[in-house]
Interface confidence: low
């Protein structure tokens, strides 16, 4: 059993995750993640489902964060900015946006890199899932450390 | 003894640090930090070593973060973007990158300011150190609050 | 009574807040916030005062964060960059800056969006308040999730 599990006692185990971006051939705007590299998965009270969402088993307050590095060019992209969204799907409820960040595309050629960081404290219900959406997944940088996603239970 | 020390009880003291950037004449790419201004150093379970790395005494999960503000110009800089890296050195192991962010240089003259924020949850071993690397330390802004580095133990 | 209140026991309740930006006709540089949308207010040990500051009742270490998305244009703005500041006001003391981030204005027309994230660990005294200042509040984006402010007690 994971050593983090019992650190706070049986009733209040430590719950945290940090997962690493993974390039995907899927056309979906939802970013894909993997338990690879220097990842964190404290115990089975938080899981990575379908490589796309972090799902929690316990109700409570969580600090949830995501970082996305991307490379884009103003001329080659749509006029709309690059937007990263942290989204929530609770059982029996609609998806909702928790956090968003927007960066206008760079004029650098062939593309200019930018990094976005999102983070906030939110209440999650048992079975709630959080995921990250971007306007153009093909622009996301997957080099070591550039794009990641995680949470910790307060 | 620090008042934070006992807040969680002897067995699980509060461990946190927040240090402030310091300009350095060193040519190293590792940023320098100081316990100055409105800094935090909860107790001796986390220390700032050689002004460059935060070192922890206890194994566990930590939320580690860094913020770097820099001022650069596309014409005066290398073609590569400004990259800030949060790195880990554990006893007997290689240094490794935990997090990175990249921002293309601004076209503003004489330079354009940009801010990078990094943060994530990672397991640290006893004696592990974390530090921040940048591509060009001379571009970093050291005005009040612009560049800082810290961690907290979950 | 809020369900978070007792999660850590009577002596150490969970304290956290996450508030959502609100457009304001006020000419002040202090951003306005509201308990709306998917906000968090764990209990009465942290409160939103006058829609502008988060005030805590208990001394301790807090992770405090803010995210500001703004849309600006280099030609239409002052030469100075857009700066977001996280500030502290403790009872009987001067205000002080805890964190700042700066982004040079975009050349995109009519304006280019950028997002700033600030976060760090700080000791707060009973009655201390934190708030967010920006150079030009009229440039701030108030769409869902773009601009938010919060804290959590360690």
């Amino acid at each position: 059993e994971n050593s983090f599990e019992m650190q706070k006692g049986d009733q209040n185990p430590q719950i945290a995750a940090h997962v690493i971006s993974e390039a995907s051939s899927k056309t979906t705007s939802v970013l894909q993640w993997a338990e690879k590299g220097y990842y964190t998965m404290s115990n089975n009270l938080v899981t990575l489902e379908n490589g796309k969402q972090l799902t929690v088993k316990r109700q409570g307050l969580y600090y949830i964060y995501a970082q996305v590095t991307f490379c884009s060019n103003r001329e080659a992209s749509s006029q709309a900015p690059f937007i990263a969204s942290l989204c929530l799907k609770s059982p029996g409820r609609f998806e909702r946006i928790l956090l968003r960040a927007a960066n206008t595309h760079s004029s650098a050629k062939p593309c200019g890199q930018q990094s976005i960081h999102l983070g906030g404290v939110f209440e999650l219900q048992p079975g709630a899932s959080v995921f990250v959406n971007v306007t153009d997944p093909s622009q996301v940088s997957h080099g070591t450390g550039f794009t990641s996603f995680g949470l910790l239970k307060l | 003894e620090n008042s934070f020390e006992m807040q969680k009880g002897d067995q699980n003291p509060q461990i946190a640090a927040h240090v402030i950037s310091e300009a350095s004449s060193k040519t190293t790419s590792v940023l320098q930090w100081a316990e100055k201004g409105y800094y935090t150093m909860s107790n001796n379970l986390v220390t700032l070593e050689n002004g460059k790395q935060l070192t922890v005494k206890r194994q566990g999960l930590y939320y580690i973060y860094a913020q770097v503000t820099f001022c650069s110009n596309r014409e005066a800089s290398s073609q590569a973007p400004f990259i800030a890296s949060l790195c880990l050195k554990s006893p007997g192991r290689f240094e490794r990158i935990l997090l990175r962010a990249a921002n293309t240089h601004s076209s503003a003259k004489p330079c354009g300011q940009q801010s990078i924020h990094l943060g994530g949850v990672f397991e640290l071993q006893p004696g592990a150190s974390v530090f921040v690397n940048v591509t060009d330390p001379s571009q970093v802004s050291h005005g009040t609050g612009f560049t800082s580095f810290g961690l907290l133990k979950l | 009574e809020n369900s978070f209140e007792m999660q850590k026991g009577d002596q150490n309740p969970q304290i956290a807040a996450h508030v959502i930006s609100e457009a304001s006709s006020k000419t002040t540089s202090v951003l306005q916030w509201a308990e709306k949308g998917y906000y968090t207010m764990s209990n009465n040990l942290v409160t939103l005062e006058n829609g502008k500051q988060l005030t805590v009742k208990r001394q301790g270490l807090y992770y405090i964060y803010a995210q500001v998305t703004f849309c600006s244009n280099r030609e239409a703005s002052s030469q100075a960059p857009f700066i977001a500041s996280l500030c502290l006001k403790s009872p009987g003391r001067f205000e002080r800056i805890l964190l700042r981030a700066a982004n040079t204005h975009s050349s995109a027309k009519p304006c280019g969006q950028q997002s700033i994230h600030l976060g760090g660990v700080f000791e707060l005294q009973p009655g201390a308040s934190v708030f967010v200042n920006v150079t030009d509040p009229s440039q701030v984006s108030h769409g869902t999730g773009f601009t938010s402010f919060g804290l959590l007690k360690l």
């Epitope: 590299g37 080099g143 070591t144 | 007997g92 290689f94 490794r96 990158i97 990249a102 690397n133 | -």
Partner: nanobody, 128 residues
Framework: EVQLVESGGGLVQPGGSLRLSCAAS????????IGWFRQAPGKEREGVSC???????SYTDSVKGRFTISRDNAKNTVYLQMNSLKPEDTAVYYC??????????????????????WGQGTLVTVSS
């Protein structure tokens, strides 16, 4: 303990083949750029090939089309398959790594000064 150990060297005739292995211990090789270098007697060390943390590869001009670098993450090993060997390929071959090689993890570098951790080397002799 962190280690890189090369193997697979030996004596081979011109036109022959060898496969060199670089086995890592103490760290996960998958997340680092790895370079192969060689040093012939009386000459400076030169870059031969490298593979980035994301799997992209680079070769020095003299070995392009003859050498192939690959990685087996399950075995924590990088290989250098050397075909159509020539006498001028005779050298001690080293593998090396650095935790921060590669622009955005998608490229690698065959300049030896970019690498700070080296194996002990394996001798390749191409002679008839």
């Amino acid at each position: 303990e962190v280690q890189l150990v090369e193997s697979g060297g030996g004596l081979v005739q011109p036109g022959g083949s060898l496969r060199l292995s670089c086995a890592a211990s103490g760290f996960t090789l998958e997340y680092y750029a790895i370079g192969w270098f060689r040093q012939a007697p009386g000459k400076e060390r030169e870059g031969v090939s490298c593979i980035s943390s994301e799997g992209s590869t680079s070769y020095t001009d003299s070995v392009k089309g003859r050498f192939t670098i690959s990685r087996d993450n399950a075995k924590n090993t990088v290989y250098l398959q050397m075909n159509s060997l020539k006498p001028e390929d005779t050298a001690v071959y080293y593998c090396a790594t650095d935790p921060d090689r590669g622009f955005l993890g998608s490229s690698c570098d065959t300049q030896s000064h970019q690498y700070d951790f080296w194996g002990q080397g394996t001798l390749v002799t191409v002679s008839s």
